[in-house]
């Protein structure tokens, strides 16, 4: 669809005469009828295919054509057509003069034709005009012509349909050939669909509008790039959505159970040495000088009884001085002026000679010790309790008093409170500092499994497309993790892909 | 050939919500070269287009409706359906689901056989 | 919001031609489509992008769009022919139906 443009520029007719070569009374009133048809190598009369157009009384004898669009587009003449332009065309320009105010063909005499011009060739679609200038022995006729394509037809020959349009049926504005051209922002076949945001994640992001970028489910951050980690995940990360790998040192389901206690919180003082013994349990190996659990008690070099025979410690600030009884002397009083005529040998010790008599040996009973039997054995000074158990001496023996959660003869033993399987249906146990957690399977809650609630959520194979279906735990629902090329909460969607 | 058939009650009481289903068979609804779309027309009145969905799941609804139109799609049974919220007697009407193409600027050119649902209590 | 005009009717002689046209503000700018409905009948898609025939549909039916007014021309009309019909066309994201001329052919 387009239109054939004729513009006509002057006419010179200086005698004023017709075709004939009789004069025009008074003077030549100048019509013009054209005719656009299809190329002829010889111009003939006939039908007028591509369409004909008349204009007014454009002047007497000889005159120049003003431009005018505007009165019912006169000058130029428009000659719409409803085909496919063809690139050839055969023009016929007659003027002719008009005695009355009748211009049909059939009331004009038929020797009121002025002149006839015929002309052909090619034309290609453009926005040039071609400028001519057809001579006759009276007459002159200058003019120019052009064909372009008509609102919304686009290429070489107007042939193209396109109209810009900016909805969900297409955004774009049509080019020269009459091809799309995608607004900003918009790609595919008819520019429907949008360019997402710069560096979202091709199979785990999506969009609906230019620039944006939504993540599939599973998935979250600008570029959707980052996995959602397991509901209630505490310490631990994911590499695909719904994981919960556990950082060092922490373990369990939801990564929440310490297993670095010694690490996270530091609890040995004094630059002891801290070692893991288990959940949320440790052991302080203590510098000398120092005691306690977490070896958070300084010694006294006195605690350690340096001084043999019943002699006495007094604290020093470099050390420690060891006050000595009557027949003893020495740094620890471990050298005697006795014999056993003195009877040295305290608590039922029995005396021995030695060195011809320049020295004794006591042997001392059960319970006491010393070189004089002096001391009442303490069996707890190698600290043999384990896991902060408390030694107390009984007599010949001795016994360690546990800390909660420990047991055995050293406290060496982590009481299991899981041991006497408490979780029903099948719940799994987790020991805890001061109890214990199941963790129930689908179907069932409470402290202990105990009570049945609903079924398996992934049972009923909510998700499609070979998506992989995950139970959260904590709300008995389901989440589905799609394969690449698909989305929604059941991975029903398959995505356009450009 | 494709095909699309509408379904669901033909009787819906005032104020509750109208639900209805369209399968499509004999192609994919999950092509990229179509929107599937909902048309109503009221006995002995014209057609009034009520809203379309793509496979990805963008919507797009008349104006007039927009307050009380659900469409969305189910790729994986190759279905789409309408929900209409707190309907009235002006509702009555013969519901189509249709297929509008890309190619041919948003046109229907498949058409399901329509179903009448009557809102009366 | 978007207005599309049809006449009610239009009343055309078997093998003469019947035009019916579709009024609405810069329709030109738009594609306008044109549906054929027999009584009891789904709509059936008889132009799309002003002027195109879909396969299956007779050539005498044609369109043309310009200016604010499409039309839907149907050269040699036939009693088949009689049904209503329908002008439609995109106003940003919505659908616009006309409200539908009833042709009969005498």
């Known amino acids: 669809s387009g239109v054939f443009q004729l513009q006509l520029q002057e006419f010179i007719n200086e005698r004023g005469v017709l075709a004939s070569g009789r004069p025009c009374e008074p003077g030549c009133r100048t019509f013009f009828r054209v005719c656009l048809k299809h190329f002829q190598a010889v111009v003939s009369p006939g039908p007028c295919t591509f369409g004909t157009v008349s204009t007014p009384v454009l002047g007497t004898n000889s005159f120049a054509v003003r431009d005018d669009s505007s009165g019912g587009g006169r000058n130029p003449l428009q000659l719409p057509f409803n085909f496919t332009w063809p690139g050839t065309f055969s023009l016929i320009i007659e003027a002719w003069h008009a005695p009355g105010d009748d211009l049909r063909p059939e009331a004009l005499p038929p020797d009121a034709l002025i002149s006839k011009i015929a002309i052909q060739g090619s034309l290609a679609v453009g926005q040039n005009w071609l400028l001519d200038e057809q001579t006759s022995t009276l007459t002159r006729l200058r003019y120019s012509y052009r064909v372009i394509c008509s609102d919304n037809y686009y290429g070489d020959n107007c042939s193209r349909l396109c109209k810009k349009r900016n909805d969900h049926f297409g955004h774009y504005v049509c080019q020269p050939d009459g091809n799309l051209s995608c607004l900003p922002g918009w790609t595919g076949e008819y520019c429907q669909q949008p360019i997402c945001l710069s560096g979202c994640h091709e199979q785990n992001g999506y969009c609906s509008k230019p620039a944006e970028c939504l993540c599939r489910p599973g998935w979250q951050g600008r570029l959707c790039n980052e996995c959602i980690p397991h509901n209630g995940c505490r310490h631990g990360t994911c590499s695909t959505p719904w994981q919960c790998t556990c950082d060092e040192g922490w373990g369990g389901l939801f990564c929440d159970q310490d297993l670095n206690y010694c690490t996270h919180h530091s609890p040995c003082k004094n630059g002891a040495t801290c070692s893991n013994s288990g959940q949320r349990s440790y052991t302080c190996t203590c510098r000398p000088g120092y005691t306690g659990v977490d070896c958070e008690l300084e010694l006294s070099e006195c605690d350690s009884n340096p001084c043999r025979n019943g002699g006495s410690c007094k604290d020093q600030e470099d050390g420690y001085h060891c006050l000595c009884p009557p027949g003893y002397y020495g740094l620890h009083c471990e050298h005697s002026t006795l014999s056993c005529a003195d009877s040295p040998c305290f608590n039922g010790g029995s005396c021995r000679e030695r060195n011809q008599g320049a020295n004794y040996a006591c042997e001392c009973p059960p319970n006491f010790t010393g070189s004089n039997c002096e001391k009442k054995v303490d069996r707890c000074t190698s600290n043999p309790c384990a896991n902060g158990g408390q030694c107390l001496n009984r007599g010949p023996s001795r016994m360690c008093r546990c800390r909660p959660g420990f047991t055995g003869t050293y406290c060496e033993l982590h009481v299991s409170d899981c041991a006497r399987n408490p979780c029903a249906h099948g719940g799994t146990c987790h020991d805890l500092e001061n109890g214990l957690m199941c963790t129930c399977p689908a179907g069932f809650s409470g402290r202990r499994c105990e009570v049945r609630t609903s079924i398996d959520a992934c049972a009923s194979s909510p998700c499609f497309n070979r998506a992989t279906c995950y139970t959260d735990l904590s709300t008995d629902t389901f989440v589905c993790n799609c394969p690449y090329g698909f989305v929604g909460s059941r991975c029903e969607f398959p995505v356009g892909l450009p | 050939e494709v095909q699309l058939q509408e379904s669901g009650p033909g009787l819906v009481k005032p104020s509750e919500t109208l639900s209805l289903t369209c399968t499509v068979s004999?192609?994919?609804?999950?092509?990229?070269?179509?929107?599937w779309g909902w048309i109503r027309q009221p006995p002995g009145k014209g057609l009034e287009w009520i809203g379309d969905i793509y496979y990805t799941g963008s919507t797009y609804y008349n104006p007039s409706l927009k307050s009380r139109v659900t469409i969305s799609v189910d790729t994986s049974k190759n279905q789409f359906s309408l929900k209409l919220s707190s309907v009235t007697a002006a509702d009555t009407a013969v519901y189509y689901c249709?297929?509008?193409?890309?190619?041919?600027?948003?046109?229907?050119?498949?058409w399901g056989q329509g179903t009448l649902v009557t809102v009366s209590s | 919001s978007y207005e599309l005009t049809q006449p009610p009717s239009v009343s055309v002689s078997p093998g003469q031609t019947a035009s019916i046209t579709c009024s609405g503000q810069?329709?030109?700018?738009?594609?306008a489509s044109w549906y054929q409905q027999k009584p009891g009948q789904s709509p059936v898609l008889v132009i799309y992008?002003?002027?195109k025939r879909p396969s299956g549909i007779p050539e005498r039916f044609s369109g043309s769009n310009s200016g604010d007014t499409a039309t839907l021309t149907i050269s040699g009309t036939q009693p088949m022919d009689e049904a209503d019909y329908y002008c439609q066309a995109w106003d940003r994201d919505t659908g616009v139906f006309g409200y539908g001329t009833k042709v009969t052919v005498l």
């Open positions: 810069r329709l030109g700018d738009k594609y």
């Open positions: 249709a297929r509008q193409a890309l190619a041919m600027g948003g046109g229907s050119d498949k």
């Open positions: 992008e002003d002027s």
């Open positions: 004999g192609g994919s609804i999950s092509s990229s070269s179509y929107y």
